[in-house]
């Protein structure tokens, strides 16, 4: 789901799940602004005071990052230009489950979308040949 309208931009997320102890991806896309220097990406989590991750002016800005995510997050910096604001979350924990907000600012406006992130010990489906 996403939002759009005057002075706002469309941001799209996809609900996903992460395996405990492995790396996970929180998916978020937007219509890319060709002017990278104007793009800000913020990831927030319900109930968490600090930011999950912030990317602005072409680089990570982690001064306001919450301690529980320290050293565990990254965006795909080379893919922001094509509208990929997805977050890589390393070493997924049970407590990482919850509602996340992907918040985007560009020269055109602002937009955000929420996603539900589930965590657990998910086994790979068996394939019978």
């Amino acid at each position: 789901f996403g939002i759009s309208g005057r002075h706002s931009i469309t941001v799209t997320t996809v609900a996903s799940a992460g395996n405990i102890g492995e790396d996970g991806i929180l998916s978020c896309t937007f219509e890319p602004d060709i002017k990278l220097s104007d793009i800000v990406i913020q990831w927030l989590k319900e109930g968490v005071l600090g930011l999950v991750h912030e990317f602005k002016e072409g680089k990570d800005e982690l001064s306001e990052q919450d301690e529980m995510f320290r050293g565990r997050t990254a965006v795909f910096a080379d893919q922001v230009i094509v509208g990929n604001a997805s977050l890589r979350l390393k070493n997924v924990q049970l407590t990482d489950a919850g509602t996340y907000k992907c918040y985007i600012i560009t020269s055109k406006g602002k937009g955000n979308a929420n996603l539900e992130y589930k965590t657990g010990a998910f086994s790979m489906p068996e394939v019978n040949v």
Partner: antibody, heavy 116, light 107 residues
């Protein structure tokens, strides 16, 4: 095969107009931003204009602002550059290019000559 | 505007030589730099994006490095088909700007 094909170039008098087209094939055109880049005879590359995938973001070089208009028709897989009030210094080969992490796909170019 | 300055403007080299071209930005562009190769009468071809990522299909003898303001394109062992003009380009901010080009000629 991923391909871009420019057309619409030619000889035009100073003050005249031309409309360049760039036909895209082999990829989902509506998912990509696009650029126009030009190259004057014997010179280097100069960025002209850019447009995002849904036309939400449009940028121009100062040298063409107010005279050139970039647009696209995603239903026709085509990029356009409307050039008005042409000047001798606009003489160049004009390339369209796909916007990815780099300008990863280029057309063969179309020549625009502005001369009286 | 961000100015991109390449050096040298031209160089002469032999097949098998290691060739290095530098590009300097007038302000920090993080890693948002591309390298292109252009042969006479042809469209440019993307070689390196995001300063050091090799574009699909480009030979591994091409490599890029650097971040901030100083960048390098290296051809580890020059091949006959590598004689061309090379351009750097920043895509951190508009206007998008190219370096003036470096022409690699046969010695």
């Amino acid at each position: 095969e991923v391909q871009l094909l420019e057309s619409g170039g030619g000889l035009v008098q100073p003050g005249g107009s031309l409309r360049l087209s760039c036909a895209a094939s082999g990829f989902t055109f509506s998912s990509y931003g696009m650029h126009w880049v030009r190259q004057a005879p014997g010179k280097g590359l100069e960025w002209v204009a850019s447009i995002s995938s849904s036309s939400g973001y449009i940028y121009y070089a100062d040298s063409v602002k107010g005279r050139f208009t970039i647009s696209r028709d995603n239903s026709k897989n085509t990029l356009y550059l409307q050039m008005n009030s042409l000047r001798a210094e606009d003489t160049a080969v004009y390339y369209c290019a796909r916007a990815s992490s780099g300008m990863d796909v280029w057309g063969q170019g179309t020549t625009v000559t502005v001369s009286s | 505007d961000i100015q991109m300055t390449q050096s040298p403007s031209s160089l002469s080299a032999s097949v098998g030589d290691r060739v290095t071209i530098t590009c300097r930005a007038s302000q920090s562009i993080r890693s948002y730099l591309n390298w292109y190769q252009q042969k006479p009468g042809k469209a440019p071809k993307l070689l390196i994006y995001y300063a050091s990522s090799l574009q699909s299909g480009v030979p591994s003898r091409f490599s890029g490095s650097g971040s901030g303001t100083d960048f390098t394109l290296t051809i580890s062992s020059l091949q006959p088909e590598d004689f061309a003009t090379y351009y750097c380009q920043q895509y951190y901010s508009t206007p998008l700007t190219f370096g003036q080009g470096t022409k690699v000629e046969i010695k």
